[in-house]
Every structure is written in C-alpha cells, then in structure tokens.
C-alpha cells in the first residue's frame, strides 16, 4: 500500500549551529518517515499456462510490481537463474530480446511485464513439473525473482490450485541494499522519536564537527532482519531440463547485444497467432529476493552492480507509471 506524506522543505542548517535536535535531526525524521510510508514492497508475479490447443506448449507470464525502472528480465527453467536454471530468454528494454530453444516468442506485454511462449514439441520441450523463473533487474530495488510451475497432473479441462510451495530467495546483497536502508531508516526513526520523547529540547550549540553520520551504518541491517529474510532456494530437479542448453547463458560483454534488433518484441502480430486459449495459470508466486542485480559470474551484459543503467527506449515514461507504482 502506498500513501503519501508531505515533507517540509529541506533547508541547510544555519552556519555554525547544530545540536542533538538541531535542524538536521528535525528534518531527518520527516525524510525517513516519508521513505517508510511511501516505499511500496517490490514483488514479482508469475503465471504459467498450458495452451489448450497445444498441450505440451506453455506460456510463462511474469511482471514486476515496484517503483523502479526495469533494466533486464531473465526467464529461466529448471530452477532459478544462477542456481541450476537454464536461461530461456533475456529481455532488455532498449537492446531487444534474445531467446533460446525451446522458447518460441518472448515479448513485452507492458513496461513491467513480459510473456514467453515455449515450443511444444522436440527433445527440449518442457513438461508439467518444470519450474519456470523470472528475474527482474530494477533500479533502485535491485534484482527480484519468482518461480512457478504447472503441477504434474495438469489437464487442460481441469483447473488445479497452484503449487503450494513457491521458490523463494533472499540474497544478502539485496538485504544490504535499498530494503536495508529503508529498514534501518524506519528503525532509526522510531529510535529518534523515542529519544525525543524522553529528552527536553536542548539549546542549539556551535558545531565542532561535521554533522555527517557514518555511511556504513545505513547499510547494516539488524541480524534479526537478516534471519527473517534469508530464505534459501527450494531447488526442484526436473528431468525435462535439457543439458544442451546450459551453454546458452549470456556471459558475453556488451557486444552480446549487438546483434539484437531494438524493439524486437514490438512487431505487431495478427490475432490468429495468439488465438489459443490458455487454461489457468498455475503457480503464481511472490518473490522475496532482492539481490543487487546479479551475482558475480552471472551478470547481465553490463558492468557494475546496478550502476550502469540503460536508457528506456519506450520513450519518456508517463507522468504516473503502472498502477501508480512507477
């Protein structure tokens, strides 16, 4: 839930004046309060559908619910990306789309969601218990991933509930990222307010030292928060994952995108190609992973942990974004 709070204009403290409850300390709680209240929790949703017309064909749909801009989407199967999963498609908002068999068609649906159709025949075709994962690299939230699968008993005529145990991941790097800062900020805010309640307002005194707080503290969440958020992967082995696709991971540098046509996902298609009726999406999962983009050795084809961002090719974003979360 996102609400808005008004923040007083930030004014520099008067020269030479700073105290325990000086300008800086009075303004900081308001800033932190605003951050705490307005920070929506990022989330990734996943749907896996079996096409009714081609029973061995799947459509994977997934999207990112967050306030940042998406810089890369990776769809994998056989487990999460970087944990035994095999990349099926990589979608970049500017540099286009790259996909590997059995992926037939990867497309952007909105600026925060994608779909991927998998071929239904051949040695590398998926089976019902295959796990499909979507990983969204976003700034400033970092990397978020969720997984879903069809239960083995999938029948186009029937509709079963989604698999009960989602694959969850919480990378320590992400906890130390934006979420950590916000968590610390909220705790610090409570601490300030509590301290303020038990202490008379002091007089302003001349400043002897720089009023900057040490930065390292902001990146150190409590052990309790780490314990609460660190959920290991529940790895699912599947006989359907072809070993031959393991070499398809995009480990190349920026030149890897050179052959990709911009807006490869935006060629309009007639209704016929998309007319099959999917049966229910099975498996729609909430993600808890928030890694800062990607772990070493499995970075998207740009350097730096979320610092080198690509411009969005879809033109300037609308003033308000999707559902008010942009």
């Amino acid at each position: 839930m996102r609400t808005e709070a008004q923040v007083p204009a930030l004014q520099p403290p008067e020269p030479g004046l700073e105290g325990a409850m000086g300008h800086r300390t009075l303004v900081l709680p308001w800033v932190l309060l605003t951050l705490c209240v307005t920070a929506g929790t990022p989330e990734v949703w996943v749907q896996v559908r079996m096409e009714a017309t081609e029973l061995s064909s799947f459509t994977i749909r997934c999207g990112f619910l967050g306030s940042g801009s998406i810089s890369l989407v990776t769809v994998s199967w056989g487990g999460p990306n970087g944990a035994g999963g095999t990349t099926l498609a990589v979608l970049h908002p500017e540099r286009g789309i790259r996909q590997w068999a059995p992926a037939r068609q990867a497309r952007w649906e909105t600026q925060s969601s994608i779909s991927l159709i998998l071929e239904g025949s051949g040695a590398s075709s998926p089976c019902a218990n295959t796990t499909f994962c979507c990983k969204f690299a976003s700034f400033p939230e970092g990397s978020w991933e969720a997984c879903g699968s069809l239960p083995p008993s999938s029948d186009p005529g029937l509709s079963a509930p989604p698999t009960p145990a989602p694959i969850l991941r919480a990378d320590l790097a992400g906890i130390l990222g934006v979420s950590g800062v916000l968590l610390f900020g909220c705790v610090y805010l409570l601490h300030l307010l509590r301290r303020h309640k038990h202490r008379p307002a002091p007089r302003l005194q001349p400043s002897r030292t720089s009023p900057q707080a040490p930065r390292a503290r902001a990146w150190a969440p409590s052990q309790a928060s780490q314990a609460a958020l660190h959920v290991p992967y529940a790895t699912i082995n599947t006989s359907c994952r072809p070993a031959t696709l393991d070499t398809a991971h995009p480990h190349g540098g920026p030149s890897w995108w050179a052959s990709l046509p911009t807006h490869a996902a935006h060629r309009p298609q007639g209704p016929a190609a998309w007319a099959s009726t999917p049966i229910p999406a099975r498996g729609s999962f909430v993600s808890v992973e928030n890694g800062l983009y990607a772990q070493a050795g499995e970075r998207p084809p740009h350097t730096g942990p979320g610092l080198t961002l690509f411009p969005d090719p879809r033109g300037p974003r609308a003033m308000e974004g999707p559902l008010g979360v942009r």
Epitope: E109, T110, T277
Partner: antibody
C-alpha cells in the same frame, strides 16, 4: 494526464459489424496493454480481449471468431472490430489501460453505448 | 470460464462504518484479484490490484485481502463519496471475469 477517448457508432443493424476506435493520450502504447470490456444489464461486465505493448493479442474464446483488436502505435489508437452483431451484443463498450499485465485496468475510456437494432 | 461470485448484491451501511465486501471464486486464483468502483453512468475505477495493492490516488481507507478462493474489500471508515457499486475481477486465467457487483447504499 492519462486519457482514453472512444469513437464509434451508437446504433448497429443486426448482422452488421461494429468498429470502435480508442485514442489514448498521456502515455504511449509501447508500454501498456489496452483491454476491451463491455457491460450490459443482462450479462454484466464481459472482458473481450487485450492487445499488449508488443502487439500480441488475447481474446475471450466466446468472441474470438468474430473479434479483432489491432493498433496504430504512432497514432496512439487501438481498434476494436466485431462482426455479425446481434441484439444481445447491445452494451457499453469500453477500452481500458493495463499497466502491469495483471489485467488490472487502471484507466478507462468513457464507454461507447452500442445498440443493435433494426 | 472461472466464476466470480459476489453473494451480497446490495449492502446498506452508515457513514463512518467499517464495510467489508466479499468475493468468492470457483477455484484458487493465487491472489490475481482486482477490485473496482463504479458510480452511476461512470466508468470503472481501479481501487485494489493483486489482492491488496492500493492503486495510486485511492484513499487509504480502502484495503483488500484474501487468498485461495475467498477475497474481500474493506472500507474502514465509510464516506458519502464511497456510495457506489463494487466489482471484483480475476486475472488468473483467460478470460478475465468479473463478479456481479455489490451495490453499497447508505442506511
């Protein structure tokens, strides 16, 4: 600001075709899906179909044989075409924006009231 | 098609009341549920998406909850401007389907 405007006929003869244009402003069709929904007293709200930013479409199976959704991104227009209308197709037809892929329609057009009658 | 049932078609409440509108689905929809408000002769207005996420600009007195096949929309402190018809809608399987609506009236 975000706006969806609709234009189309109010009266359609039975067995004739329906064409409605949804013209959007305040956002680009390259980043959003556009759904078509109709509402009638007898049948309530019925989802007809969607065209996503990438151009791919999805249709309600009940209408697929006579429904077509297309768009002209450069003109910020989305088109609904429905063939062989009958009296029970009388309804208010609306286009609505989808921002997340969740079929959650955050902005709606005003609706086009369509009466099928001779 | 997946069936959406809003058992209460009409609901009366007093201003300031806490009002809960329910929606039941014919199968598990994994939280892919949205809520809309519609005033007479007006378009639908998105309130809540993905079960509990508040759409921008919607007052915080609106909240959504639920899981599996049972979902609800709650208005914590009913105001005059909330008098309208409320629809639930699933986005879990094609085609997306809507409930029949719950008309909220003042006692």
């Amino acid at each position: 600001q975000v706006q969806l405007k609709q234009s189309g006929p109010g009266l359609v003869q039975p067995s004739q075709n329906l064409s409605i244009t949804c013209t959007v402003s305040g956002f680009s069709l390259t980043g959003y899906g556009i759904n078509w929904v109709r509402q009638s007293p007898g049948k309530g709200l019925e989802w007809l179909g969607v065209i996503w930013s990438g151009g791919n479409t999805e249709y309600n199976a009940a209408f697929r044989s006579r429904l077509s959704i297309s768009k002209d991104t450069s003109k910020s227009q989305v088109f609904l075409k429905m063939n062989s209308l009958q009296a029970d197709d009388t309804a208010i037809y609306s286009c609505a924006r989808d921002s997340t892929g969740l079929y959650a329609m955050d902005y709606w057009g005003p609706g086009t009231s369509v009466t099928v009658s001779s | 098609d997946l069936q959406m049932t809003q058992t209460t078609s009409s609901l009366s409440a007093s201003l300031g009341d806490r009002v809960t509108i329910s929606c039941r689905t014919s199968q598990d929809i994994s939280n892919f549920l949205n809520w809309y408000q519609q005033k007479p002769d007006g378009p639908l207005k998105l309130l809540i998406y993905y079960t509990s996420r508040l759409h921008s600009g919607v007052p915080s007195r609106f909240s959504g909850s639920g899981s599996g096949t049972d979902y609800s929309l709650t208005i914590s402190n009913l105001e005059q401007e909330d008098i309208a018809t409320y629809f639930c809608q699933q986005g879990y399987m094609l085609p997306p389907t809507f409930g029949g609506g719950t008309k909220l009236e003042i006692k």
